[in-house]
């Protein structure tokens, strides 16, 4: 039961995380105009990964896409790439984890296959979450650098009467959504990896088992090997020792080939 709960929760948390990563990637508020120096502006600027927007006090909002690819900063391109990689990996992870869920039966899929799929999706979620966190952090770092650069520029060359107030940008809502979503995906991935351990057959815990062959020699076969070559198909192998108490989750409705060594 605990394994199913862990796996299911990991799936749900990752699903929410990936939805958040997608939302953050699509959001326009990656950076928003800093109003510290001009709180009464009638024009409010904010920018996303794909377009920049201007919202007027009148309620009118105008957005313009970044129609150039080569003219954009390399850092922005890198952030875009990280977020897209995160989404793609997350989406594949979700697809894999659906089939890996213990509560879903697909034909006669074995526990080992489900365990492998759970581990694969878990790793994908972890990498997806890391990509999102990295992407958002790179963008945040870029904002901080530009913020202090524009602050320095604001106080230079102001000896004359005319002020050129440079627009400074600060963290937008999308950054926080991205950080939280990346964290959730990461946590979900870790939970999937933990669930995988519970799903995997506990063959490695089996002690060496002695078999009485019909011949005059005694054969020893460690339980860790799945292959049963060298034995006749009709040989009945007895499980002498089960390394741990089997949880309710691990009870099979029908015997699988991993129930016996």
């Amino acid at each position: 039961m605990a394994v199913t709960a862990c796996q299911g929760l990991g799936f749900v948390v990752s699903l929410i995380g990936i939805a958040g990563i997608i939302a953050a990637t699509c959001m326009d508020q990656w950076s928003t105009q800093d109003l510290y120096n001009n709180p009464v502006t009638a024009v409010f600027n904010y920018q996303g990964l794909w377009r920049s927007c201007v919202r007027e006090s009148s309620g009118f909002t105008e957005c313009r896409g970044y129609f150039t690819l080569l003219g954009l900063p390399a850092m922005l391109q890198a952030v875009r790439a990280l977020m897209i990689v995160g989404i793609v990996l997350g989406a594949i992870g979700l697809l894999v984890s659906i089939f890996a869920l213990k509560c879903i039966r697909i034909g006669s899929m074995e526990d080992s296959a489900k365990a492998n799929m759970t581990l694969t999706s878990g790793i994908m979620f972890i990498v997806s979450g890391l990509c999102a966190i990295a992407g958002v952090s790179v963008f945040a770092n870029m904002l901080v650098t530009n913020f202090w650069m524009s602050t320095a520029n604001m106080y230079t060359g102001m000896g004359g009467m005319v002020q050129t107030v440079q627009t400074r940008y600060t963290f937008g809502a999308a950054l926080f959504v991205g950080w939280v979503a990346g964290g959730l995906t990461l946590i979900g991935g870790v939970m999937m990896c933990i669930a995988c351990r519970g799903l995997a057959p506990e063959e490695t815990n089996y002690k060496a088992v002695s078999y009485h062959a019909s011949g005059h020699s005694v054969a020893y076969k460690p339980g860790g090997f799945k292959a049963s070559t060298g034995f006749g198909s009709n040989t009945k192998n007895k499980k002498i020792y089960d390394g741990g108490a089997r949880t309710e989750d691990e009870v099979q409705s029908y015997p699988s080939k991993h129930d016996y060594v």
């Epitope: 009464v40 502006t41 201007v54 006090s57 009148s58 309620g59 009118f60 313009r64």
Partner: antibody, heavy 116, light 113 residues
């Protein structure tokens, strides 16, 4: 077509309050912003404040303590209230509206004289 | 507050002449995000309400004759009347609509000789 019409008292005694109503037609106050602008005789234009479509307001910093702008969307009316009037508040008061930040439509104005 | 300075305060021109009036702002009115200048020009004929001529520094309001041309960027702006007509006798005001309070210039009075 779009029309704005101001109605005011004409004469106000010093230290009293001024109330002017701007009645609009041809557009909805829920989507248009309405500003108040005044012009002292023979002088330039002075922006007083604005009420936006969503009901939010901005006031001129010099008048913020004694100016209030409100509206009634259902009656298509915008109200200006200016307290503690002085003689230098004598001016023609205009309401001006627009969908954006500039003033595309203007009322004909109402002359307010502050005098004892 | 952004201070708007207009010059000249008045000018007299003959019909058909080209008229140029200037407006300077104490801060840049150019929004870097959409590359638009938040400046408008108004015409006020004697005894009338002001009328919008130009917004975004160079976009003519519908119904405004094409002899009225707005130009400039940042802090320096110009309203040009390419061929002045008798009906252009009026006061012309520039106004910034970039930040509140929205401030007007003191105006330029155009007289016809």
């Amino acid at each position: 077509q779009v029309q704005l019409k101001e109605s005011g008292p004409g004469l106000v005694a010093p230290s009293q309050s001024l109330s002017i109503t701007c009645t609009v037609s041809g557009f909805s106050l829920t989507s248009y912003g309405v500003s108040w602008v005044r012009q002292p005789p023979g002088k330039g234009l002075e922006w007083l404040g604005v009420i936006w479509g969503d009901g939010s307001t901005n006031y001129h910093s010099a008048l913020i303590s004694r100016l209030s702008i409100s509206k009634d969307n259902s009656k298509s009316q915008v109200f200006l209230k200016l307290n503690s009037l002085q003689t230098d508040d004598t001016a023609t008061y205009y309401c001006a509206g627009g969908l954006r930040l500039w003033f595309a439509y203007w009322g004909q104005g109402t002359l307010v004289t502050v005098s004892a | 507050d952004i201070v708007m300075t207009q010059s000249p305060s008045s000018l007299a021109m003959s019909v058909g002449q080209k008229v140029t009036m200037s407006c300077k702002s104490s801060q840049s009115l150019l929004n870097s995000s959409n590359q638009k200048n938040y400046l408008a020009w108004y015409q006020q004929k004697p005894g009338q309400s002001p009328k919008l001529l130009v917004y975004f520094a160079s976009t003519r309001e519908s119904g405004v004759p094409d002899r009225f041309i707005g130009s400039g960027s940042g802090t320096d702006f110009t309203l040009t009347i390419s061929s002045v007509q008798a009906e252009d006798l009026a006061d012309y005001f520039c106004q910034q609509h970039y930040s509140t309070p929205f401030t007007f210039g003191s105006g330029t009075k155009l007289e016809i000789k």
